[in-house]
Interface confidence: low
């Protein structure tokens, strides 16, 4: 049985502090009490705390902890969120410029192919944007579709302008011939390689940044266990029960408590380190054909080269295609 | 040859960008991000210490609280006694991470694997299949990287790397910053409770 408190001892100081936490004083004893019902702030002598106060302290301690955690991650969170937004916008700008360059190339060099070329180029770059943002599109299919669509227009407008407006059946034949005869040489394959590599890397880069945000958000909103709440209460608030309002926790003690409370969170550390180092490795490799800026902004030139390749071989190609698609053409002329 | 006059730039802003003194490109921006991220590499292991340094702890005071009593700051009791006869700290650690943490660890493992796969040494071996069918002379040669900007007949090459400074609000005003709603600000007197 603890000794009775001296006559002048009151819980006035504790009360005025607790009032800031919980307006209404009914939970604070007038004078120190034995506190045998306390579960966290186990008293060595008379105490100014009640069971209800303990519960309030526990709730407050956990809220404090959540607040501290959020303030700790604020700078990091802002860094990743800001950069994810910046890069997404930057990649969209690159795609937009790449499309503009390609359209301008057609307008300046092959005006007869517009506006159909504009339409096909537009569709291609729309797919590029969607792919970067995570759509389930096959890059090879995108490139094939671009060249499949372009060749009938090139054939009917540049190589064989005497033909009447192409009908669907010759178009289909020309699309097939484009691949069988490799009319664009190795350029489509070259573009596939460059575009798929650069876009894959870009896409994973954006995915990684978005996951970074998710990681911070997850740890930012962790709810701490009751055990942790009890440890924090004992560290931050139990001293008040003894009227020790100005005393602070010992540094080493705080570290032990925090390591206990954050044991689960700290398990992320190994994977977080690996995440940053792997992202660095990826970024270091994002150049030349692994840099979408470099690849997409040079596409207009490679496409131009591929059309020149077709024109250079126009004689041979026209003869071969004339035979290959003759059936379609006859049906069309009737 | 492909001729590409400036007046055909559909987005005029790009012309202004070329005059920015400090050429900030996407790749330099990426490297800058990585450098900043690397300064947070110890973020999670440093968290317990960080939180202690941002909550009231005895620094210059001779006496401090160890969970049960006032003790000398440098005494052995300062770290240990507060743990005696309390629930088992070891037990708390043994429980393992919460399901949400385990989930996010799995996602990190997955992205790390993807990032590593993407960052494999990018030797020319990967790209050799381009040579198999062969180009005609002058059609790019076997170095696919050099094909960007292609033909050698006087084509105007678009300068690699747009300067995005003029187009992107890199330095978002902190007030507009995404995530600023997450600020650690006390809510209706509930949290501002550390007393000195």
């Amino acid at each position: 049985q603890p000794p009775p408190p001296p006559p002048d001892a009151t819980c006035h100081q504790v009360r005025s502090f607790f009032q800031r936490l919980q307006p209404g004083l009914k939970w604070v004893p007038e004078t120190p009490v034995p506190g045998s019902d306390l579960q966290v702030c186990l008293p060595k002598g008379p105490t100014c705390c009640s069971r209800k106060m303990e519960e309030k302290y526990q709730l407050t301690a956990r809220l404090n902890m959540e607040q501290l955690l959020q303030s700790a991650s604020m700078e990091l969170k802002f860094l990743i969120i800001q950069n994810a937004a910046v890069f997404q916008e930057a990649f969209e700008i690159v795609v937009r410029h790449a499309k503009n360059y390609t359209n301008a190339m057609f307008k300046n060099n092959y005006p007869s192919l517009t506006p159909q070329a504009f339409e096909f180029v537009g569709e291609f770059f729309t797919d590029v944007s969607l792919y970067i943002l995570g759509s389930d599109i096959n890059v090879d299919d995108m490139v094939n579709e671009l060249f499949d669509s372009l060749f009938p227009v090139i054939y009917t407008q540049l190589m064989n302008p005497g033909l009447p407006d192409s009908a669907l059946d010759i178009n289909e034949c020309l699309r097939g011939a484009r691949r069988d005869l490799k009319v664009f040489g190795n350029f489509p394959k070259l573009i596939m390689t460059q575009v798929s590599k650069s876009l894959q890397v870009t896409r994973i880069f954006l995915q990684a940044l978005n996951l970074g945000i998710e990681v911070i958000n997850t740890t930012d909103h962790l709810k701490f266990s009751k055990d942790c709440g009890r440890m924090l209460t004992r560290m931050w608030y139990c001293s008040y029960c003894q009227g020790l309002m100005m005393v602070k926790p010992c540094g080493g003690y705080c570290n032990v408590v925090m390591q206990g409370c954050m044991a689960g969170v700290v398990e992320i550390d190994k994977y977080w380190r690996e995440y940053i180092l792997s992202l660095e490795e990826l970024v270091n490799g994002m150049y030349r054909i692994y840099d979408m800026e470099n690849v997409l902004l040079g596409l207009f030139s490679t496409i131009h080269d591929s059309i020149q390749y077709v024109q250079k071989n126009a004689g041979k190609l026209t003869t071969t295609i004339g035979k290959l698609c003759a059936h379609s053409q006859q049906r069309q002329y009737r | 040859s492909a001729y590409y006059p400036e007046d055909l730039f559909i987005d005029k802003k790009v012309l202004k960008v070329a005059h920015v003194e400090h050429e900030e490109t996407l790749s330099s921006r990426r490297r800058e991000l990585i450098q900043k991220l690397k300064s947070f590499i110890s973020f999670y292991s440093a968290l317990p210490g960080y939180i202690c340094s941002h909550s009231p702890v005895a620094e210059n005071d001779t006496l401090c609280w160890n969970g049960q009593e006032l003790v000398e700051r440098y005494s052995q009791k300062a770290a240990r006694n507060g743990m005696k006869n309390q629930f088992n700290l070891h037990e708390l650690k043994m429980k393992g991470p919460e399901p949400v943490v385990s989930q996010i660890i799995d996602k990190l493992k997955h992205i790390n694997q993807l990032l590593r796969t993407m960052s494999m040494p990018k030797g020319r071996v990967l790209d050799k299949n381009l040579d198999e069918e062969g180009f005609e002379s002058g059609d790019c040669g076997d170095d696919e990287d050099e094909c960007i900007g292609g033909s050698g007949d006087g084509m105007i090459k678009v300068k690699n790397q747009l300067r995005f400074l003029a187009e992107l609000a890199y330095d978002l005003d902190v007030d507009d910053a995404p995530g600023n709603s997450q600020q650690a600000t006390p809510k209706d007197n509930e949290i501002s409770t550390f007393h000195n």
Partner: antibody, heavy 126, light 106 residues
Framework: EVQLVESGGGLVQPGGSLRLSCAAS????????MSWVRQAPGKGLEWVSG????????YYADSVKGRFTISRDNSKNTLYLQMNSLRAEDTAVYYC???????????????????WGQGTTVTVSS | QSVLTQPPSVSGAPGQRVTISCTGS?????VHWYQQLPGRAPKLLIY???NRPSGVPDRFSGSNSGTSASLAITGLQAEDEADYYC??????????FGGGTKLTVL
């Protein structure tokens, strides 16, 4: 006793230069971030520039960026402010202040300026 | 750069309680308070929103709520007549000061 003593102030013409020094004593200088704060006659306090303890982080107010340079010599316990292209609006009392800060790995948080010098007066006038 | 806003002046009779507000701290960093007596260098009064350096009487206290902070002085004394400044940091770790509040003891 923890003390900061500024020197180097004086009268200078617009466009001219001055170098302020701040000698520190009574604490481990290299462990603390330092700042320069100025106060124009009859006006409030304006932060000018700051520097981390190790010297790897420098920060400037927009009004002086590109004109002023902060530096420190931890072996001499001295903080400097090199002021170039001075303007009339730079006229003020310049205080050197020690930052209260916690540095823990990457985490560098500042808790106000707990020690101030007595100030040195800089007058920019033709 | 961010701006902290303070009332230009406040006044109170000896023994009274006065408060000085400081709004606009949006970066999540704490707000600190300084006292500048006439003709003297500023002196840190409250740091970390509500901590007093040693030697500062407990009549001075700080509080923080969202993007605003306030300094309260109870039992006002003649020697409290001074300029009071709040200060915080922006997201780039640049220090920012409020415009200052002149406290007059009537």
């Amino acid at each position: 006793e923890v003390q900061l003593v500024e020197s180097g102030g004086g009268l200078v013409q617009p466009g001219g230069s001055l170098r302020l020094s701040c000698a520190a004593s009574g604490f481990t200088f290299g462990e603390y971030a330092m700042s320069w704060v100025r106060q124009a006659p009859g006006k409030g306090l304006e932060w000018v520039s700051g520097m981390s303890g190790s010297g790897d982080g420098t920060y400037y107010a927009d009004s002086v960026k590109g004109r002023f340079t902060i530096s420190r010599d931890n072996s001499k316990n001295t903080l400097y402010l090199q002021m170039n292209s001075l303007r009339a609006e730079d006229t003020a009392v310049y205080y050197c202040a020690k930052e209260m800060d916690y540095q823990l790995g990457w985490m560098h948080y500042y808790y106000g300026m707990d020690v101030w010098g007595q100030g040195t007066t800089v007058t920019v006038s033709s | 750069q961010s701006v902290l806003t303070q009332p230009p002046s406040v006044s109170g009779a000896p023994g009274q309680r006065v408060t000085i507000s400081c709004t606009g701290s949006s970066s999540g960093y704490d707000v600190h308070w300084y006292q500048q007596l006439p003709g003297r260098a500023p002196k840190l009064l409250i740091y970390g929103s509500n901590n007093r350096p040693s030697g500062v009487p407990d009549r001075f206290s700080g509080s923080n709520s969202g993007t605003s902070a306030s300094l309260a002085i109870t039992g006002l004394q003649a020697e409290d007549e001074a300029d009071y400044y709040c200060q915080s940091y922006d997201s780039s770790l640049n220090a920012i000061f409020g415009g200052g509040t002149k406290l007059t003891v009537l």
